[in-house]
């Protein structure tokens, strides 16, 4: 039959070549001459003339060694024709199976492969995977099957069997307990691997294990006890830093230490901290201690680490005995801001208050006292019984001094402690007022129209405090009234001006007594400004011919200066006549007032 | 009926060079592989070299590799066999010879004469 | 390399008697061995291939054989024109070696 079986041939053939391989026969040879010829790869096609055949004979030729790992298999077509090139055969499948020979060793796909496992696993925990390639085959030969085993293990500690590998899939793993980083951070095992399933070829790699640090070494105190003096009534005062040695993986959370104070600080005195370098704990004050009160103070102090212990492992304490140095301790004003309530006005050498300040230290110091501020100078200070006393009169209304009613006083205590210290306290003085100030108004300087004036409104202000204010009341004086009214509007804070006749255009004084609730009376004189006009008024319109009231021409000023050296050659005369004189000015206002009434009627 | 027949041989030097050829017919010669083979003064046979039908491979024994090349043009159905560097030990008839049911050497020519000396 | 040594290197005998030429394989090549003859005026011609299987036109009195690394021609009755060289060949190893050649003599 046109049939061929699958023909095998063993890579890397020696020869001689070209070799036989099989003969090609169609069985239509009986009736005439056939011509054999091969097709495809390996024949006419790339890898081109690998495989020939012989045209009359049939037979076919492998004409060079094969390589499996390059072409493992060939697929060709047979051809038969008669003489005159007509095909007598359908083309035939020719399968030509390159047969595997060992002839490649086992290669490590790393030269060195690295792995890590905790320390003091449990046997049987997997460290790594190694993988050798051979390129032989694998299925139908042990030719590429590689087992794997270990040659060598460095260092032989605790034993040279610490690891085993399992000698088909490469996976390393543990056999033995007693791994300790802590005595072998890292073991160097050199692999093989055997092809032909461990009877062949052997080639070697290197396989570093690493071992990991588990938290199985606590920290340790070096030293376990510490004396340590600190000044009292320090904060954030390093009492003492403590050393430990933990033989895990520097700088890791195995070997990082947390600190705790686990007795001795009731109070709530110190605290500790771990320095992020030294890994020392650092124990300082959180409160000032205080000599009078506890001298020592024997601290706990108990040392972990960031990451949980793997193991069950003691903890350690030290111990830090805490000795309190005493200091100099300013003397404390008690309370340290005095409020003393004193009336405005005392006397001077009246006593406001006795003040005084207490030293914690043990000893009996003598504290003396002196004023540190008082801006006024107001007080005084005795240095030894700390009594304050008026030198000086409080006066509730200076408003340099005062704010809301209040003097600030700051006052000084002072030990005889070696140094002396000195501590402060403030004195406020809440000044109780006294109907020391009459009423004013304002403004004190009025302009108005003699024609159909505008009611003048004033304002009340006293610098005193109620019940020493409003209501108001208000009196005109010195005949003001019989050209003038005041009257106080309903409220009681201001007041109203009128004038209620006519005035001719000059300057008035207005004397206005203005009494307060309390009755306590002031007199003001307004300096009244009276203008030729009608209505409301600024400033008086016109060239101004008055006296003193207005300014203007050169004959006014002259007019001045004259009665000026009058009044001072006769100034006994002006006192006797003082009356008859401001009479007869308002009287020719009166005649003038009537001869201008005279004008409108006729007007 | 097949038939081989070479030609080219001659006296030559020692060191100097010789093309030897070798016409082919009466089969189809680019479906063999074709050899030279010599034959000594003393009658001993040796190979000397091979090509594959297609030309693709050749094949030497120790003695001549580096020094002999056999080629072939399978378009004039004729076999070379260049040799340089020529020895005394060279001097012999040089026979073309084909396969044949794919094994040597089914046809012989009648050789060709190659004498190196000086 | 393979040596093939041939035996024996000259040979007397009559026409018509029987005769047989040996060559012994140094290493094993199974059946790979031709034996060739040589005429006086040159010309070589193979007779038998793959051990024992006759060439196309060649005489039913030549026979080939093998016994162990032992490969033998053998002629049944001698014929005047059979009195020439005698070589084998082996292609089972490379490179390609042939015997030393056997002279059949006419007694």
């Known amino acids: 039959d046109w049939v061929v079986a699958p023909i095998s041939v063993p890579e890397n053939g020696k020869g001689p070549f070209p070799q036989r391989l099989n003969q090609l026969k169609s069985n239509k040879d009986r009736d005439t001459k056939i011509f054999y010829s091969i097709t495809g790869p390996g024949a006419d096609s790339p890898p081109e003339g690998v495989f020939a055949v012989e045209k009359e004979t049939g037979w076919l030729l492998l004409n060079k060694p094969l390589d499996r790992e390059e072409i493992a298999k060939y697929e060709l077509f047979g051809h038969a024709v008669s003489e005159n090139g007509a095909s007598v055969e359908d083309p035939m499948n020719i399968s030509i199976i390159v047969t595997d020979q060992n002839d490649h060793k086992p290669k490590f796909t790393q030269d060195t492969f690295r792995g890590s496992v905790l320390e003091g696993v449990l046997p049987g925990t997997s460290v790594m995977q190694v993988t050798a390639t051979d390129e032989d085959d694998a299925i139908y030969t042990y030719n590429g099957v590689v087992a794997y085993s270990i040659h060598s293990q460095e260092p032989k500690d605790p034993h040279d069997l610490m690891f085993t590998i399992h000698r088909s899939t490469g996976t390393i793993s543990v056999i033995s307990s007693g791994l300790d980083r802590e005595k072998v951070p890292e073991y160097t095992l050199t692999i093989q691997a055997t092809d032909m399933d461990g009877d062949g070829s052997t080639t070697t790699a290197v396989a570093v294990v690493e071992i990991l640090d588990a938290n199985d070494n606590a920290p340790m105190f070096e030293p376990q006890k510490y004396e340590a003096w600190v000044p009292e009534n320090e904060v954030g005062h390093e009492v003492q830093r403590l050393t430990v040695t933990d033989l895990d993986v520097p700088n890791s959370p195995a070997w990082r230490a947390t600190y705790h104070i686990v007795g001795g600080d009731d109070g709530d005195h110190f605290t500790i901290t771990t320095h992020p370098e030294t890994n020392q704990g650092v124990l300082t004050t959180k409160k000032g201690l205080d000599f009078e009160a506890q001298d020592q103070h024997t601290l706990y102090v108990e040392v972990t680490n960031e990451a949980p212990f793997a193991v069950k492992l003691p903890t350690a304490t030290a111990t830090v005995v805490v000795h309190v140095k005493d200091v100099n301790e300013a003397p404390v004003f008690v309370p340290p801001s005095k409020v003393v309530e004193v009336q405005e006005g005392i006397p001077t050498g009246e006593p406001v208050c006795v003040y005084t300040a207490e030293d914690p230290d043990k000893e009996n110091q003598k504290i003396s006292y002196r004023i540190l501020r008082d801006p006024a100078g107001w007080l005084a200070m005795d240095p030894d019984s700390g009594q304050v006393t008026a030198v000086g009169t409080l006066d509730r209304e200076d408003e340099q001094f005062v704010r809301n009613n209040i003097y600030e006083v700051m006052v000084l205590a002072m030990d005889n402690g070696s140094p002396p210290t000195t501590g402060t306290g403030t004195l406020l003085l809440t000044l109780i007022d006294v109907n020391d100030h009459g009423p004013v108004p304002e403004p004190r300087q009025i302009t108005i129209c003699n024609q159909s004036p505008v009611r003048q409104v004033l304002n009340i202000t006293d610098k005193d405090l109620s019940p020493h204010t409003s209501p108001f009341q208000a009196q005109l004086t010195d005949d003001s009234d019989i050209y003038w009214t005041a009257e106080v509007n309903e409220e009681g804070d201001t007041v109203v001006l009128s004038l209620k006749k006519f005035l001719k255009q000059d300057t008035y004084d207005v004397h206005l007594s203005l009494s307060d609730h309390g009755n306590k009376e002031q007199l003001t004189v307004i300096r009244a400004t009276v203008c030729d006009c009608h209505g409301h008024v600024e400033t008086c319109p016109g060239p101004w011919k008055g006296g003193s009231g207005g300014g203007g021409s050169g004959a006014g000023v002259i007019a001045v200066i004259v009665v000026v050296v009058i009044a001072i050659v006769a100034g006994i005369v002006v006192l006797v006549i003082s009356r008859k004189k401001r009479m007869a000015k308002y009287e020719k206002a009166e005649i003038k007032e009537m001869g201008e009434m005279h004008r409108e009627l006729n007007a | 009926v097949q038939l081989v027949e070479e030609s080219g041989g001659g006296l030559v030097k020692p060191g100097g060079s010789l093309k030897l050829s070798c016409a082919a017919s009466?089969?189809?010669?680019?479906?063999?592989?074709m050899s030279w083979v010599r034959q000594t003064p003393d009658k001993r046979l040796e190979w000397v070299a091979t090509i594959s039908s297609g030309g693709h491979y050749t094949y030497y024994p120790d003695s001549v590799k580096g020094r002999f090349t056999i080629s072939r043009d399978n378009a004039k159905n004729t076999l070379y066999l260049q040799m340089s560097s020529l020895k005394s030990e060279d001097t012999a008839m040089y026979y073309c010879?084909?396969?044949?049911?794919?094994?040597?050497?089914?046809?012989w020519g009648q050789g060709t004469t190659v004498t190196v000396s000086s | 390399e393979l040596v093939m040594t041939q035996s024996p290197s000259s040979l007397s005998a009559s026409l018509g008697e029987g005769v047989s030429l040996t060559c012994r394989a140094s290493q094993d090549i199974g059946i790979n061995l031709i034996w060739l003859r040589q005429e006086p005026d040159g010309t070589i011609k193979r007779l038998i291939y793959d051990t024992s299987s006759l060439d196309s036109g060649v005489p039913k009195r030549f026979s080939g054989s093998r016994s162990g690394s032992d490969y033998s021609l053998t002629i049944s009755s001698l014929e005047s024109e059979d009195f020439v060289h005698y070589y084998c060949?082996?292609?089972?190893?490379?490179?390609?070696?042939f015997g030393a050649g056997t002279k059949l003599e006419i007694k």
């Open positions: 010879a084909s396969y044949y049911y794919g094994i040597p050497f089914g046809y």
């Open positions: 009466g089969f189809t010669f680019s479906s063999y592989a």
């Open positions: 060949l082996q292609y089972g190893s490379s490179p390609l070696t």
